[in-house]
Amino acid sequence: KKVVLGKKGDTVELTCTASQKKSIQFHWKNSNQIKILGNQGSFLTKGPSKLNDRADSRRSLWDQGNFPLIIKNLKIEDSDTYICEVEDQKEEVQLLVFGLTANSDTHLLQGQSLTLTLESPPGSSPSVQCRSPRGKNIQGGKTLSVSQLELQDSGTWTCTVLQNQKKVEFKIDIVVLAFQKASSIVYKKEGEQVEFSFPLAFTVEKLTGSGELWWQAERASSSKSWITFDLKNKEVSVKRVTQDPKLQMGKKLPLHLTLPQALPQYAGSGNLTLALEAKTGKLHQEVNLVVMRATQLQKNLTCEVWGPTSPKLMLSLKLENKEAKVSKREKAVWVLNPEAGMWQCLLSDSGQVLLESNIKVLPTWSTPVQP
């Protein structure tokens, strides 16, 4: 008996061939021996089987002795043995229809689990192997689970169902809902305008939800909500914003926040959360602000940074075009009785300058100038 595998929702064509290359009488029946379709001369006739409105044949092939049964919009319950009767012969074809679906939705939040469920006909014992867009293989039976979805899991998952040495391939598009970056850090000199951007790693037709930015200033004992906003069809509207600092927010995606001035009291870390409509859970992006200030008070030139810096960052004070006078893995450095000239305060990571602030030291009879 020939075995044919089909996919739920697809169309399958079961072949039936006569030795005579001409149109002769044929019938397709199901395992109950109830007629699905057949011919009466050049006319296609249909019996009362459940396939009645989804079954067809190709009249153009009848003259060549080919009498296919075409079943559209396959259902799992179409799995059956189909019998073609032609020239006093019976050809049997076993059709097995499989379906593969993702749990609830194909749009999942980063960190959530993806469950793929195989629908299969009774009596079948298929095996399934799926390959993720990043090349990871998972195997299973009726269900396959992937926990802690990552951004790289977005894309087309290719799943192969094996039964009776035959295989059928499913492609499922999975969208992992996440921000492009889990965390970002902004380095600014005191007084500069700060731009925070929160680009999404996915595109959808309509995006609706609400969000909030909580901020934990380094100097503050507790975190506070800086801004809350709504998102409706990719349009952003601010609901509530603190007076200090008075953040501004862009009206379009990507989510964009502007802090008018970088001040030491704002240095710290924030957590932007976005709750999407019809989704349980939230998207998160951490954002950090490091603020630098260089000052000269009497005979002391000081450079300070506030905010979340890594212990391996180096803070240096140097006179322009000269070797560093002081260089430490600390958040503040100073030079006593600095020479006149343009001093640079540098925050660097393995030689790469992250933040730079210049201060002009005048001869001792003058006051300092900060360009």
Partner: antibody
């Protein structure tokens, strides 16, 4: 034992729409085809059409342009609408369950029938 | 559509008689034929399917034969409770079609 009960107005005016409902009791409406058949006085039985629980239908070509069948699985009911009726549509209307088995396709459970008269 | 022609349209027989009804299809319907019994004022009841197979609970005095286009329904020994109308119905093709019916009466 599954039982079927037809309900609907016994009198319909010409050119109006005949509406009947069949309620399935003591059993599920799921996974069967359900047919409507009518019988005019002194005449044979005429198959009007059938509906599957998924909503898929097959109608008799002679009535197709006027027939609509619907199914409501939550209420265990299916219905028939026949538009633009004339006196020729006066008949006893039956609902029945179609059953498929090995070599078998027949209406094994019937309602008791409801008489519909088309008259002004 | 497949036309089903039944004959006779009515008959009268005595209790114990052998009663035969014929049904002819306009096209070959293989064995896809049902026979129904309808008692006065009641809904039809399926007696035989696939031309000759008895439905569960139906007395063995009812039988059927035939294939293709010509079919016969027989009551070997007519009983008083057998009065009513007998109809054939094909299920080879949609639309399902019925014969005109044969009314059986007791003499």
């Amino acid at each position: 034992q599954v039982q079927l009960q037809e309900s609907g107005p016994g009198l319909v005016k010409p050119s109006e729409t005949l509406s009947l409902t069949c309620t399935v009791s003591n059993g599920s409406i799921s996974s069967y085809y359900w047919s409507w058949i009518r019988q005019s006085a002194g005449k044979g039985l005429e198959w009007i059409g059938r509906i599957y629980t998924s909503g898929s239908t097959n109608y008799n070509p002679s009535l197709k342009s006027r027939v609509t069948m619907l199914v409501d699985t939550s209420k265990n009911q299916f219905s028939l609408k026949l538009s633009s009726v004339t006196a020729a549509d006066t008949a006893v209307y039956y609902c029945a369950r179609d059953r498929e088995d090995y070599y078998y396709y027949g209406m094994d459970v019937w309602g008791q029938g409801t008489t519909v008269t088309v008259s002004s | 559509d497949i036309q089903m022609t039944q004959s006779p349209s009515s008959l009268s027989a005595s209790v114990g008689d052998r009663v035969t009804i014929t049904c002819q299809a306009s096209h070959d319907i293989s064995n896809y034929l049902n026979w129904y019994q309808q008692k006065p004022g009641k809904a039809p009841k399926l007696l035989l399917y696939y031309a000759s197979n008895l439905e569960t609970g139906v007395p063995s005095r009812f039988s059927g034969s035939g294939s293709g286009t010509d079919f016969t329904f027989t009551i070997t020994s007519l009983q008083p409770e057998d009065i009513g109308t007998y109809s054939c119905q094909q299920y080879d093709n949609l639309p399902l079609t019925f014969g005109g019916g044969t009314k059986v009466e007791i003499k």
